[in-house]
């Protein structure tokens, strides 16, 4: 099949006091090979500080996955979700508040 770029969505939720969990979801992409990772100041976080979901079919012939990490509240600007898929890449910031969701489709 032809390449379908992922839709990338970053959300945040309250964790323990002073911390938030940030989750980066990539969906509706093909083929299934993808790099999805959290970066701090542009540097990838170590594997032991991130949690990844499996790359799963979403029922439409495309795939979805996610990566999450916990960060200190107030340091959101230092963190971005980095995505690479089929030779294209994109960077996605943490939204500024709970109600803000960022959806980006990349070509």
């Amino acid at each position: 099949g032809s390449t379908v770029p992922p839709m990338v969505n970053v959300t945040r939720s309250e964790a323990s006091e002073g911390n938030i969990t940030v989750t980066c979801r990539a969906s509706s992409f093909y083929p299934r090979n993808i790099i999805l990772t959290w970066r701090q100041d542009g540097v990838s976080l170590s594997h032991d500080t991130q949690q990844w979901g499996d790359v799963l079919p979403d029922g439409n012939g495309t795939y979805q996955t996610w990566v999450a990490t916990r960060i200190c509240r107030g340091e959101e600007q230092r963190f971005t979700c980095y995505m690479e898929h089929s030779g294209n890449h994109s960077t996605h910031p943490v939204p500024s508040g709970n109600s803000h969701h960022h959806h980006h489709h990349h070509h």
Epitope: D41, G42, V43, S44, L45, T49, R78, T80, H89, T91
Partner: antibody, heavy 118, light 108 residues
Framework: EIQLVQSGAEVKKPGASVKVSCKPS????????IYWVRQAPGQGLEWIGY????????IYNQQFKDRATLTVDKSTSTAYLELSSLRSEDTAVYYC???????????WGQGTLVTVSS | EIVLTQSPATLSLSPGERATLSCSAS???????LHWYQQKPGQSPRLLIY???NLASGVPARFSGSGSGTDYTLTISSLEPEDFAVYYC?????????FGQGTKVEIK
């Protein structure tokens, strides 16, 4: 091969501004942050700030926030550092560097000497 | 601001000797955020060791790094002539990003 090529040496008067360019090659320009660091003669390294070329986000060392301006031109894959209100203490070699997969500074430009003298 | 203090300021050794360079942080930092750079006269810095103990590409195995918390060490097991340079530690755990003041390894 990854390279970062910087503009040439500059001599400026106190109070003037200087703009240093940095043109990386060998990788996708918007995939890595560009950092700026300076080194006064015979001294250590001092971080100025960084810019994410993809989203345009800039993080400054607060010490330079009022006088440093970081920009990128995605059409030419070039990053810029402009420093205003120059004083003699700003005489230094200014380096650009690329954020790495596992460290803040994995490739460096050759440096640009900025001399501030009346 | 995390202050990194390197010691000694200058290390005078002969080729073949072992060099031990220290980097002490004013606050504890994760080992994931401590890196070492080498700088020779008239040259740009070069990444040497990342995340405390991992050798950067092309760096010889005589270099090694260790440490945790506030105390980190760079070791050169047997100095080669090309190793005489200034070495900087750097932390990326908190802003502002900071470097140590450097240790100069000079020929005795």
């Amino acid at each position: 091969e990854i390279q970062l090529v910087q503009s040439g040496a500059e001599v400026k008067k106190p109070g003037a501004s200087v703009k240093v360019s940095c043109k990386p090659s060998g990788y996708a320009f918007t995939s890595n942050n560009i950092y700026w660091v300076r080194q006064a003669p015979g001294q250590g390294l001092e971080w100025i700030g960084y810019i994410d070329p993809y989203i345009g986000r800039i993080i400054y060392n607060q010490q330079f926030k009022d006088r440093a301006t970081l920009t990128v031109d995605k059409s030419t894959s070039t990053a810029y550092l402009e420093l205003s209100s120059l004083r003699s203490e700003d005489t230094a070699v200014y380096y650009c560097s690329r954020s790495g997969e596992r460290s803040n500074f994995d490739y460096w430009g050759q440096g640009t000497l900025v001399t501030v003298s009346s | 601001e995390i202050v990194l203090t390197q010691s000694p300021a200058t290390l005078s050794l002969s080729p073949g000797e072992r060099a031990t360079l220290s980097c002490s942080a004013s606050s504890s930092i994760s080992s994931n955020y401590l890196h070492w750079y080498q700088q020779k006269p008239g040259q740009s810095p070069r990444l040497l060791i990342y995340r405390t103990s991992n050798l950067a590409s092309g760096v010889p195995a005589r270099f090694s790094g260790s440490g945790s918390g506030t105390d980190y060490t760079l070791t050169i097991s047997s100095l080669e002539p090309e190793d005489f340079a200034v070495y900087y530690c750097q932390q990326g755990g908190s802003l502002p990003l900071t470097f140590g003041q450097g240790t100069k390894v000079e020929i005795k």
